[in-house]
Interface confidence: medium
């Protein structure tokens, strides 16, 4: 919005709320809110909440989503989690225990159940819970390849820490490969980094879910915290609607919320799903800070304006040198939601839902 | 711009051109075009053109700039190049020739001359010219640390190739450290990747600028192509203007330029600095494809509209659920320019100058 007329803030808020109503339904490809007749009483199952929290953590870790997104990424992603095959499985016997590596295997039938087609996969993350670490450790991730060779994927420098911390590796390409192939069990190896000079490196980092003499069988104690793949994929029934490529993208709230800025700024708006939209079908969260952009972006350049006066205003009011600058979102963040389809709870992430800052564009 | 009235395209273009006039001056923090009184006759010096081309290559390699940028990044960056200390320098004698590593040292006084304060450094890239490569090679980059130890920085998987190719490593943090410290010579090591299992890796890749029996002394033949640091920094005199953080960000042209789309789309606009702005002070390029966004973004949601009809339009016309969607740039690309300050030619990069695509926001 870019107007210097007196603005009816309430009208703008109502328009934004109604736009969000359409946005959420559109992202979920629903023509109307889903029926709640099949939803069982009581709280959400633990496993669903754990999944929702994983998704929320991912958002917190990443903050804004600066990357532009193809049309496929506009639509909500179904989030699923596939746990590592437990360490007592015979597959682990083939790989000798070593001081510098640990192995993680996954059942591809579980992956295929979650993501029936490779093209539907939007993102796959390998999540490992790192327990406390006494020394800095440089680790490398490898993918199991044909004839038991290993292919390097990525590395991470882990800082010493007294508290556990989730590690996340983007393994989208690898998981897409696995979904395309016929294998039953696929896996990763996490190794200490060895340089060509120093080759005596030991893997010092403890990853939850692996039996060691030092800790006892944490795999049993914390089964849900053993390594897992966090998958985000377009549900099969939504896939046929997707076309080739149309994009979207965008970035702060501290200044605007604490000032009386009249020009373009992010304005506070909390959407309560029940109160504002009359919706009861979204089980988590109860609402979210959607916010919106408002305020004029004066066109500040003309031949008869004194150059020096306007230059300082450029960065703020018309950084993109638009012919008619407009106050629009810059940083947008996603929103994970939990809702039911029939009796089945679903966790889905809606992209670009929360406006963190605005810009004149 | 978001309007469904008949649009005077020429007026919009003129407004955009005048806005660009201000934008460029503003990014350079100039109140008016710089005096050309001291500019010597004749073409630009070779070294300046080489630097300009390096900057252009960087842009081409990166394409769009998806990352949001703090205010500091809004302003033009001065681009400089610091060549590696030549291999016959005694510093190289301290590091034994090895089959798995090559060493690259830099004179920090040259770095400090280019970037007087660490905080001014915006980006530093280590550029290496890889000659033809027969086999896939996994390489690692290390930074020389105190007491001649080496700290791992990053890695790259190099595909076999018959033609030379520039490799670029982001070493901004490292160079910032070097600028903060008192050392005279600092360096990098490029090594073959050795895993803890296979330790017989040889560095197969040939980097231009290193003498080997196989190639003769290419350091002498191609001096300017030996490894270098490409630095982008805020000039000292511009630094005091910078405040904390205010951002900007955004993405395609193929569809719009080849269609008759009436709605929001990127429109073609080439700016010739001389013809359109009456400017002769920008020596390179002669002009650029600025483009601009134009076309309506209908507000497509209201309580009395049938839900199902509007859902399909959401992604296109109001993906951000704005109360008044607006046609704005999505992907923006930077523009390197060459101009004189007194007798001194400068290469600077202006961020977010080229509109590659638009979106309703």
């Amino acid at each position: 919005l870019s107007t210097s007329k007196t603005i009816d803030m309430e009208l703008v808020k109502r328009k934004r709320i109604e736009a969000i109503r359409g946005q959420i339904l559109s992202k979920l490809r629903l023509a109307s809110p889903p029926s709640q007749g099949e939803v069982p009483p009581g709280p959400l199952p633990e496993a669903v909440l754990a999944l929702y929290n994983s998704t929320r953590d991912r958002v917190a870790g990443e903050s804004a989503e600066p990357e532009p997104e193809p049309e496929a990424d506009y639509y909500a992603k179904e989030v699923t989690r596939v746990l590592m095959v437990e360490t007592h499985n015979e597959i682990y016997d083939k790989f000798k225990q070593s001081t510098h590596s640990i192995y993680m295997f996954f059942n591809t039938s579980e992956l295929r159940e979650a993501v029936p087609e490779p093209v539907l996969l939007s993102r796959a993350e390998l999540r490992l819970l790192r327990l406390k670490l006494k020394v800095e450790q440089h680790v490398e991730l490898y993918q199991k390849y044909s004839n038991n060779s290993w292919r390097y994927l990525s590395n991470r420098l882990l800082a010493p820490s007294d508290s556990p911390e989730w590690l996340s590796f983007d393994v989208t390409g690898v998981v897409r490969q696995w979904l395309s192939r016929g294998g039953e069990i696929e896996g990763f190896r996490l190794s200490a980094h060895c340089s060509c000079d120093s080759r005596d490196n030991t893997l010092q980092v403890d990853i939850n879910g692996f039996t060691t003499g030092r800790r006892g069988d944490l795999a049993t104690i914390h089964g849900m915290n053993r390594p897992f793949l966090l998958l985000m994929a377009t549900p099969l029934e939504r896939a046929q609607h997707l076309q080739s490529s149309r994009h979207r993208a965008a970035l702060d709230t501290n200044y605007c919320f604490s000032s009386t800025e009249k020009n373009c700024c992010v304005r506070q708006l909390y959407i309560d799903f029940r109160k504002d939209l009359g919706w009861k079908w979204i089980h988590e969260p109860k609402g979210y800070h959607a916010n919106f952009c408002l305020g004029p972006c004066p066109y500040i350049w003309s031949l008869d304006t004194q150059y020096s006066k306007v230059l300082a205003l450029y960065n703020q009011h018309n950084p993109g040198a638009s012919a008619a600058p407009c106050c629009v979102p810059q940083a947008l963040e996603p929103l994970p939601i939990v809702y039911y389809v029939g009796r089945k709870p679903k966790v889905e992430q809606l992209s670009n839902m929360i406006v963190r800052s605005c810009k004149c564009s | 711009l978001s309007t469904s009235k008949t649009i005077d395209m020429e007026l919009v273009k003129r407004k955009r051109i005048e806005a660009i006039r201000g934008q460029i001056l503003s990014k350079l923090r100039l109140a008016s075009p710089p005096s050309q009184g001291e500019v010597p006759p004749g073409p630009l010096p070779e070294a300046v053109l080489a630097l300009y081309n390096s900057t252009r290559d960087r842009v081409a390699g990166e394409s769009a700039e998806p990352e949001p940028e703090p205010e500091a990044d809004y302003y033009a960056k001065e681009v400089t190049r610091v060549l590696m200390v030549e291999t016959h320098n005694e510093i190289y004698d301290k590091f034994k020739q090895s089959t798995h590593s090559i060493y690259m040292f830099f004179n920090t006084s040259e770095l400090r001359e280019a970037v007087p304060e660490p905080v001014l450094l915006s980006r530093a890239e280590l550029r290496l010219l890889r000659l033809k490569l027969k086999v896939e090679q996994h390489v690692e980059l290390y930074q020389k640390y105190s007491n001649n130890s080496w700290r791992y920085l990053s890695n790259r998987l190099l595909a076999p190739s018959d033609s030379p190719e520039w490799l670029s490593f982001d070493v901004t943090g490292v160079v910032r450290q070097w600028l903060s410290r008192g050392g005279e010579i600092e360096g990098f090591r490029l090594s073959a990747h050795c895993s803890c299992d296979s330790r017989d890796n040889t560095l197969q890749v040939d980097i231009n600028g290193f003498t080997t029996g196989r190639r003769g002394d290419l350091a002498t033949i191609h001096g300017m192509n030996r490894p270098f640091l490409l630095l982008m920094a805020t000039p000292l005199e511009r630094a005091q203007h910078l405040q904390s953080s205010r951002h900007r960000a955004a993405l395609d042209t193929n569809y719009c330029f080849s269609s008759t789309e009436k709605n929001c789309c990127v429109r073609q606009l080439y700016i010739d600095f001389r013809k359109d702005l009456g400017w002769k002070w920008i020596h390179e390029p002669k002009g650029y494809h600025a483009n601009f966004c134009l076309g309506p973004c209908p507000y497509i949601w209201s309580l009395d509209t049938q839900y199902s009809k509007v859902l399909a339009l959401y992604n296109q016309h109001n993906p951000g659920a704005s109360a008044a969607p607006c046609c704005v740039p999505q992907a923006l690309e930077p523009l390197p320019i060459v101009y004189y300050v007194g007798r001194k030619p400068k290469v600077e990069q202006l961020s977010n100058m080229i509109v590659r695509s638009c979106k309703c926001s």
């Epitope: - | 001291e38 500019v39 004749g42 002669k286 007798r343």
Partner: antibody, heavy 119, light 107 residues
Framework: EVQLLESGGGLVQPGGSLRLSCAAS????????MTWVRQAPGKGLEWVSA????????YFADSVKGRFTISRDNSKNTLYLQMNSLRAEDTAVYYC????????????WGQGTLVTVSS | DIQLTQSPSSLSASVGDRVTITCRAS??????LNWYQQKPGKAPKLLIY???NLQSGVPSRFSGSGSGTDFTLTISSLQPEDFATYYC?????????FGGGTKVEIK
């Protein structure tokens, strides 16, 4: 409006000296390099000399090098050409012109002043 | 020094004619070439700078092209006020040099 007005021309004997002036107005004089171009009667244009905006850099044609000096007084918005050891072949209309940019095109010219070297 | 050779040295044409004047440099000068018009008893006037850029206020019937060593000045439809002498100038290196000129006369 940009204006350039040359003065100081006239008749001089071979070996003599002459100082040409060019008074500039209508623009920020110090922001522009300036140049002198001459034209012998019935002949084409010949570039003589040029000077940068501050006066720090000067340029000369080989035919006048060592004999002519170019200077400027930015406080007076004036360009000068001091001509010594004049020869018959220096006879020409002398124009001062403004150098418009780093491309060195001459966008504004004075009306010229005639210098005749003859005994 | 860089020599500029203009051709023809003179030409006769009628009002409305399309006129082309060429300028050849003794070595490559990129696009460092300007064109000037001079009428008898007057100072030269800049028409085209940097080989192909029309100077402000100059009619659009004038155009310049070329790069390297070969350049062209074209008057698309000759007008009575266009009868004059035209000079090319290189600014690639010092000494700056002018071509010998092309006199456009009324046929």
């Amino acid at each position: 409006e940009v204006q350039l007005l040359e003065s100081g021309g006239g008749l001089v004997q071979p070996g003599g000296s002459l100082r040409l002036s060019c008074a500039a107005s209508g623009f920020t004089f110090a922001d522009y390099a300036m140049t002198w171009v001459r034209q012998a009667p019935g002949k084409g244009l010949e570039w003589v000399s040029a000077i940068s905006g501050s006066g720090a850099a000067t340029y000369f044609a080989d035919s006048v090098k060592g004999r002519f000096t170019i200077s400027r007084d930015n406080s007076k918005n004036t360009l000068y050409l001091q001509m010594n050891s004049l020869r018959a072949e220096d006879t020409a209309v002398y124009y001062c012109a403004r150098v418009s940019s780093g491309h060195w095109d001459f966008d504004y010219w004075g009306q010229g002043t005639l210098v005749t070297v003859s005994s | 020094d860089i020599q500029l050779t203009q051709s023809p040295s003179s030409l006769s044409a009628s009002v409305g004619d399309r006129v082309t004047i060429t300028c050849r440099a003794s070595q490559s000068i990129s696009s460092y070439l300007n064109w000037y018009q001079q009428k008898p008893g007057k100072a030269p006037k800049l028409l085209i700078y940097a080989a192909s850029n029309l100077q402000s206020g100059v009619p659009s019937r004038f155009s310049g092209s070329g790069s390297g060593t070969d350049f062209t000045l074209t008057i698309s439809s000759l007008q009575p006020e266009d009868f004059a002498t035209y000079y090319c100038q290189q600014t690639y290196t010092v000494p700056l040099t002018f071509g010998g000129g092309t006199k456009v006369e009324i046929k």
